[in-house]
Interface confidence: medium
C-alpha cells in the first residue's frame, strides 16, 4: 500500500464553472485546497449529492485512492457500520451487488470506486443531514471507511464539500511528511483567496473525486498515535431513518435472491452466486496485492443481467450457502 | 457438504520440522481464502499464516514469520503449512479454517484440527 | 498488533438467564466477529461484522457494539449454549482472537 499523501485526479472544471477566474488561477486554488483536504494519507473518499431534479433523492459516491484490491464495498447510512449505521448496499467484485431500501441502484463505477443511487419517499427518504458511510475492505491487508454529509443548506444539485471523516486513524508519517508542503500551499491559496475576493467568485462543485478524508490505515505505525487520534462518532440527527428499514433484514437476515427462474436461485457450488451487477472487465493489471482476486475470468461469470434482489421470505437456508449480510 | 480434513500433526523436537495439510472438499476450494489457526493447550486461538485464494499472497504474524510457510495445491484441494525451526511454545491444536467472504471474512468451516507437540 | 481482552473470563447462568459478555480492543477495529467452541469441537462461527447472524445461528444471540467495545448477548440462556465463547477482529493482519470466555450453566 502506499504511504504518502495522494491527491486524486483533479477533473477540468465543468462549464460554466469558471466565471471571472481564469483556469489557470482556478485550478491552482483547486489543488492547494485539494492537498490541504488529503492531508493525513487519505484513503477514502465520499460525496454526497441532492438531485436537482428529485429533491428527496441522493446520490452517494465513494472511491478508495489506496493500491490494494478491492474485496468488499460496504454503503451504510446513519453512521459507521456497526455503530449505528443500517446496510444500505454491499457490493462485491466479482459476486455482485446487493442493496436494501431506500437504495435504487448501486453500481461499480470503476473498480475502486462506486455509487449509490437513493429513492427517496415516504418513511424510509433520506434527508439533507443524514450521514453516509463507505467501508472499503481489502483482505486481509485491512479496511477504511469515510463518511459525508450533505449540508442542510446546500443548493439541489450540488455535491456535500469534502469534509473530515467522524472515524479518523491518521497516518503521522503522511501528515508529517506533507506538512511543510501544506503550509506553503495554504499560506499560497489564502493568499490567492483574498486577491479575489473582490471579484465574483462562481459556485464551485468538487469533482467526482473529491477526497474524504479516511480512516486510515488499520496498519498505521503507531497504535498509541492511532489510539490518540482517534475521534469519537458525534451524534447525528436518526429522524430520517426509516423505521421499517431495520424490518426488512433483521440481524441474522435472510437469505438474498435474485427474479430468476426457479431452476437458477440456487446457489452455485462456486463463490459467483450474488446474481446481480458484477464489476466491469478489470484489466490485467488487478492481479494485486492481496491477491484475492485476479482477472476477471477466473471466476465463474455471472450468469444473468443485473437483477433486483429482495429478500427471500423462506428464512436463511432457502439458497444454499451463506448469503444474508444483515 | 463443505469438509477440511487436517493431517501431519504429531510430536517434534525443538528445532524440528513439520508438514500439515488439510483436504478440502465440498466447495470451490481455489476460490477462498484460507487460515492456519491454532489452538494452544491454554486455549488461546492464533492464526498463524493466511494464503489468498486466487493470487495466493501470504501473511504472517511476527511470531511465525520466516519459520512457517503456508501453500495450496489448487488442483487437490489441499492446503499447506511447513513449520521449521520449531519451538515449545508452537505445541498447539492446528486447525485450517476457511474465509468466507459473504462473511466478510470470517472463518465459516474450521477442520477438527491436528495436534502438534513440540518437546525434547 | 490489536489486543482484544474478553470479559468475564468465566462466567455462568441459568436456563432462561439473559447473559452478556464483552470483548475491549485496544485500539478501534473494523470487523468483529464471534465463535462459539464446545468441547472437543473446533470453533463455529456465530456472529459477523458486529452484529449479523451466521447461517443456522438462533436467534437469541446477538452482537452489538462498535469502536473499542463489543458485546455478545444470549436473550435466553439455554443448557446447549455452555461452551468457551471467542471474539476475533479484523482490522489488520494478523486476526486476533481474545482469550474466551467460558459460560457455564448453573
Known amino acids: 500500500m502506499r504511504t504518502e499523501a495522494q491527491v486524486p485526479a483533479l477533473q477540468p472544471p465543468e462549464p460554466g464553472l469558471e466565471g471571472a477566474m481564469g483556469h489557470r488561477t482556478l485550478v491552482l486554488p483547486w489543488v492547494l485546497l485539494t492537498l490541504c483536504v488529503t492531508a493525513g494519507t487519505p484513503e477514502v473518499w465520499v460525496q454526497v449529492r441532492m438531485e436537482a431534479t428529485e429533491l428527496s433523492s441522493f446520490t452517494i459516491r465513494c472511491g478508495f485512492l489506496g493500491s490494494g484490491s478491492i474485496s468488499l464495498v460496504t454503503v451504510s447510512w446513519g453512521g459507521p457500520n456497526g455503530a449505528g449505521g443500517t446496510t444500505l448496499a454491499v457490493l462485491h467484485p466479482e459476486r455482485g451487488i446487493r442493496q436494501w431500501a431506500p437504495a435504487r441502484q448501486a453500481r461499480w463505477e470503476t473498480q475502486s470506486s462506486i455509487s449509490l443511487i437513493l429513492e427517496g419517499s415516504g418513511a424510509s427518504s433520506p434527508c439533507a443531514n443524514t450521514t453516509f458511510c463507505c467501508k472499503f475492505a481489502s483482505f486481509p491487508e485491512g479496511s477504511w471507511e469515510a463518511c459525508g454529509s450533505l449540508p442542510p443548506s446546500s443548493d439541489p444539485g450540488l455535491s456535500a464539500p469534502p469534509t473530515p471523516a467522524p472515524i479518523l486513524r491518521a497516518d503521522l508519517a503522511g501528515i508529517l511528511g506533507v506538512s511543510g508542503v501544506l503550509l506553503f500551499g495554504c499560506v499560497y491559496l489564502l493568499h490567492l483567496l483574498r486577491r479575489h475576493k473582490h471579484r465574483p467568485a462562481p459556485r464551485l462543485q468538487p469533482s467526482r473525486t473529491s477526497p474524504q478524508a479516511p480512516r486510515a490505515r488499520a496498519w498505521a505505525p503507531s497504535q498509541a498515535s492511532q489510539a490518540a487520534l482517534h475521534v469519537p462518532y458525534a451524534t447525528i440527527n436518526t429522524s430520517c431513518r426509516p423505521a421499517t428499514l431495520d424490518t426488512a433484514h433483521p440481524h441474522g437476515g435472510p437469505s438474498w435472491w435474485a427474479s430468476l427462474p426457479t431452476h437458477a436461485a440456487h446457489r452455485p457450488q462456486g463463490p459467483a452466486a450474488w446474481a446481480s451487477t458484477p464489476i466491469p472487465a478489470r484489466g490485467s493489471f488487478v492481479s494485486v496485492e492481496n491477491g484475492l482476486y485476479a482477472q476477471a475470468g477466473e471466476r465463474p461469470p455471472h450468469t444473468g443481467p443485473g437483477l433486483t434482489l429482495f429478500p427471500d421470505p423462506r428464512g436463511p437456508r432457502a439458497m444454499e450457502g451463506p448469503l444474508g449480510v444483515r | 457438504e463443505v469438509m477440511l480434513v487436517e493431517s501431519g500433526g504429531g510430536l517434534v523436537k525443538p528445532g524440528g520440522s513439520l508438514k500439515l495439510s488439510c483436504a478440502a472438499s465440498?466447495?470451490?476450494?481455489?476460490?477462498?481464502?484460507m487460515s492456519w489457526v491454532r489452538q494452544t493447550p491454554e486455549k488461546r486461538l492464533e492464526c498463524v499464516a493466511t494464503?489468498?485464494?486466487?493470487?495466493?499472497?501470504?501473511y504472517y504474524p511476527d511470531s511465525v514469520k520466516g519459520r512457517f510457510s503456508i501453500s495450496r495445491d489448487n488442483a487437490k484441494n489441499t492446503l499447506y503449512l511447513q513449520m521449521s525451526s520449531l519451538r515449545s511454545e508452537d505445541t498447539a491444536l492446528y486447525y485450517c479454517?476457511?474465509?468466507?467472504?459473504?462473511?466478510?471474512?470470517?472463518?465459516?468451516?474450521w477442520g477438527q484440527g491436528t495436534s502438534v507437540t513440540v518437546s525434547s | 498488533q490489536i489486543v482484544l481482552t474478553q470479559s468475564p473470563a468465566i462466567m455462568s447462568a441459568s436456563p432462561g438467564e439473559k447473559v452478556t459478555m464483552t470483548c475491549s480492543a485496544n485500539?478501534?477495529?473494523?470487523?468483529i466477529y464471534w465463535y462459539q467452541q464446545k468441547p472437543g469441537s473446533s470453533p463455529r462461527l456465530l456472529i459477523y461484522?458486529?452484529?449479523n447472524l451466521a447461517s443456522g445461528v438462533p436467534v437469541r444471540f446477538s452482537g452489538s457494539g462498535s469502536g473499542t467495545s463489543y458485546y455478545l448477548t444470549i436473550s435466553r440462556m439455554e443448557a446447549e449454549d455452555a461452551a468457551t465463547y471467542y471474539c476475533q477482529q479484523w482490522s489488520s493482519f494478523p486476526f486476533t482472537f481474545g482469550s474466551g470466555t467460558k459460560l457455564e450453566i448453573k
Open positions: 494464503i489468498g485464494g486466487v493470487g495466493g499472497n501470504t
Open positions: 479454517a476457511r474465509h468466507e467472504d459473504y462473511y466478510y471474512y470470517a472463518m465459516d468451516y
Open positions: 461484522d458486529t452484529s
Open positions: 465440498g466447495f470451490s476450494f481455489s476460490s477462498y481464502s
Open positions: 485500539s478501534t477495529v473494523s470487523y
